[in-house]
């Protein structure tokens, strides 16, 4: 006979029952897996020279054994010759010294004989008004158990609790739920009805976090704005860790707190999508846009608190990318391009009104014409930044329009809108006397001067009535007064003076006459 | 001297009970397998229950089965068979049997049985 299969022969020991007190006992036979059985006893007396043999009789009339030598366990399969699916009975006989000892026999059909499992797998937790609920699926052909937890924290003992008796093919205890320190749960069963019946093993830690995830304490900071248009938000410091029970301190799932960031974008309201959620870990880069970003905290019950942090749009500005003309259709705006197919978003707002909401224009993907510039247009009467005044306009560029963390700023800059050439005209001209030969002319600042960077310069024009001869004088935007000297007495002279931007040439105020007396010696 | 005497057979009428009792000595007999066999007049003898040395599992022949009853006491030395809704076809010589269990706990056929018992007679009347 083969070692794995059941013998279907005599057993080779003479049948003759000692009947004394001692020997084989408490013989248990189960099924360990799908095509898995296991049976052991126990051996009661001197074990020296013993030799067991499992015996098992079907209802077929035929008798087998397996020879187990010392051992008082044994493992075989649905293939060994011994019918698992109708009734057998089993026994051990114990051999030694010439004489047999027998176990009480056991009658069952292995198939449906289990051992008790604990829950196994995919225990389920959840709050229910207060408490905690574990749920699980009972192991097969186990329905029908009572079932104990045992529970501690980071800094107290075991526990134990019960969960009443199950007789469904799902079992669920409730347990109680900490509320600011995390636990550590284990669970077991046995056969509901037989109080006698051996307790299964304990099982696996389940790890529940405390009811409230903690307060995230964090901080950040914000890189400069690199040239491509982006800034790194870095983390600081990092948020605390919360204290674990023993068993959950390995890579223990379901106790653990997570951090994730929500990032708000406040720039550019018209894109598609204004918020994005992303762990943590993965710090992203923005764009020099205005955020509002938040941490949130949560764990398998759900979010915790959050705390948030305003992330000012950066203020470096670009004076001299974005070029503007207006013609007589409308207004054109271009900047250097980005790469193809790029979405563009145009964002503009009055300066001053800073509160208010900024309008903005989405551009469909474009690619850079053949003088690698991009560009968006308007007509007069959509009334785009069509009044006197300044605007800060900040372009921001993305291929991916729909992911928050690909925009990056392409320019921010100033435009005077309105017919700036008009309205940027230097008014209160006037003319003082300097010396003999010179005045000084000072004027109140141009409306473009409000609008950082877009005045590039003002220009004085002085004209000689009597010659016709004229000079300009270009003066720093900076400056409202000039002298102008070399000037004849007795002559006539009018001086006008204009504002230029970079792309614009102002309109010259109003004339203003002056002359520098002929001096009479006494 | 292994001795196993069979007793409480009888005449009774059809549809009626009796309880047959086989008491064995001077053999272990938890270390045996039991069984009855009955023999009517002019036919073979033939296997109706038997049963394993620890009572766990039984066996019938298609005619007795949800009538007859085989069980033992070990404690005793003793094998019984219940017999209820008796027929008239049950009338027989009732013998009680017993073998190691080796390879086998029950044989259809006398010959693979060690001991037996004189009989005990049993006349279903209709």
């Known amino acids: 006979c083969r070692t794995s299969e059941c013998c279907f022969q005599d057993p080779p020991y003479s049948d003759a029952d000692s009947g004394s007190a001692s020997g084989p006992r408490d013989l248990s036979c189960y099924r360990i897996s799908s095509a898995g059985y296991e049976c052991s006893w126990q051996y009661e007396g001197p074990t020296a020279g013993v030799s067991h043999f499992l015996r098992c009789c079907l209802s077929s009339g035929r008798c087998c054994y397996f020879a187990t030598g010392s051992a008082t366990r044994l493992q075989f399969s649905d293939q060994a010759g011994v019918s698992v699916l109708h009734t057998v009975t089993l026994w051990v006989e114990s051999w030694a010294r010439n004489r047999t000892e027998k176990s009480p026999e056991v009658t069952l059909q292995l198939y449906k004989s289990v051992k008790y499992k604990p829950p196994l797998g995919d225990i389920k937790v959840s709050k229910l008004a207060g408490q905690l609920r574990m749920e699980w699926e009972t192991p097969d052909n186990q329905v029908g158990a009572e079932v104990q937890f045992r529970h501690r924290t980071p800094s107290s003992s075991w526990k134990l609790g019960d969960c009443g008796p199950q007789d469904d093919d799902t079992e669920s205890c409730l347990c109680p739920l900490e509320m600011n320190v995390a636990q550590e749960f284990q669970l077991r069963r046995r056969r509901l009805g037989s109080q006698g019946s051996s307790w299964s093993k304990w099982s696996s830690p389940v790890c529940v976090p405390p009811e409230n995830p903690p307060q995230p304490q964090v901080r950040f900071s914000v890189e400069q704005l690199g040239r491509d248009g982006r800034r790194r938000l870095t983390l600081k410091e990092q948020p605390t860790q919360l204290e674990l029970p023993e068993g959950c301190q390995g890579p223990a799932p379901g106790v653990e707190v997570t951090y994730q960031l929500q990032l708000h974008m406040l720039s550019c309201p018209c894109k598609a999508k204004a918020t994005r959620t992303l762990p943590l870990e993965k710090m992203p880069y923005l764009s020099g846009a205005a955020y509002n970003v938040a941490v949130i905290s949560s764990n398998r019950f759900g979010p915790g608190p959050n705390q948030t942090w305003h992330i000012p749009a950066d203020t470096h500005t670009e004076p001299v990318a974005l070029n503007i003309s207006v013609g007589t259709n409308g207004t054109t705006m271009y900047w250097p391009a980005r790469a193809q197919s790029t979405t563009y978003c145009i964002e503009w707002q009055p300066v001053g009104q800073e509160g208010s909401l900024a309008t903005c224009n989405l551009t469909a993907p474009q690619d850079p014409d053949p003088a690698g510039m991009a560009t968006y247009s308007w007509s007069r009467e959509s009334g785009a930044m069509g009044q006197e005044k300044c605007y800060h306009i900040t372009i921001f560029a993305s291929a991916h329009p729909k992911k928050l963390t690909l925009w990056s700023t392409v320019l921010s800059t100033y435009h005077f809108g309105g017919n700036a050439s008009a309205a940027g005209t230097p008014h209160h001209v006037s003319v003082k006397n300097h010396s003999l030969d010179s005045v000084s002319v000072d004027w109140a600042p141009s409306l473009l001067s409000t609008c950082p960077g877009v005045l590039k310069e003002y220009v004085v024009r002085c004209r000689d009535e009597d010659s016709n001869q004229v000079s300009e004088h270009p003066v720093q935007p900076t400056e409202t007064q000039v002298t102008l000297s070399d000037l004849r007495a007795g002559v006539a002279y009018t001086v006008q003076v204009r504002a230029d931007t970079a792309w614009l040439r102002g309109a010259w105020s109003q004339p203003q006459r002056f002359s520098i007396k002929v001096q009479v010696s006494d | 001297e292994v001795q196993l005497v069979e007793s409480g057979g009888g005449l009774v009428q059809a549809g009626g009970s009796l309880r047959l009792s086989c008491a064995a000595s001077g053999l272990t007999f938890r270390n045996y397998a039991m069984a009855w066999f009955r023999q009517a007049p002019g036919k073979e003898r033939e296997f109706v229950a038997g049963i394993t040395w620890g009572g766990g599992l039984t066996h019938y022949v298609d005619s007795v089965k949800g009538r007859f009853t085989i069980s033992r006491d070990n404690g005793k030395n003793t094998v019984y068979l219940q017999m209820n809704s008796l027929k008239s076809e049950d009338t027989a010589v009732y013998y009680c049997?017993?073998?190691?269990?080796?390879?086998?706990?029950?044989?259809?056929?006398?010959?693979?049985?060690?001991?037996w018992g004189q009989g005990t007679q049993v006349t279903v009347s209709s």
């Open positions: 049997a017993g073998k190691t269990q080796g390879s086998t706990w029950y044989h259809l056929t006398p010959d693979g049985y060690d001991y």
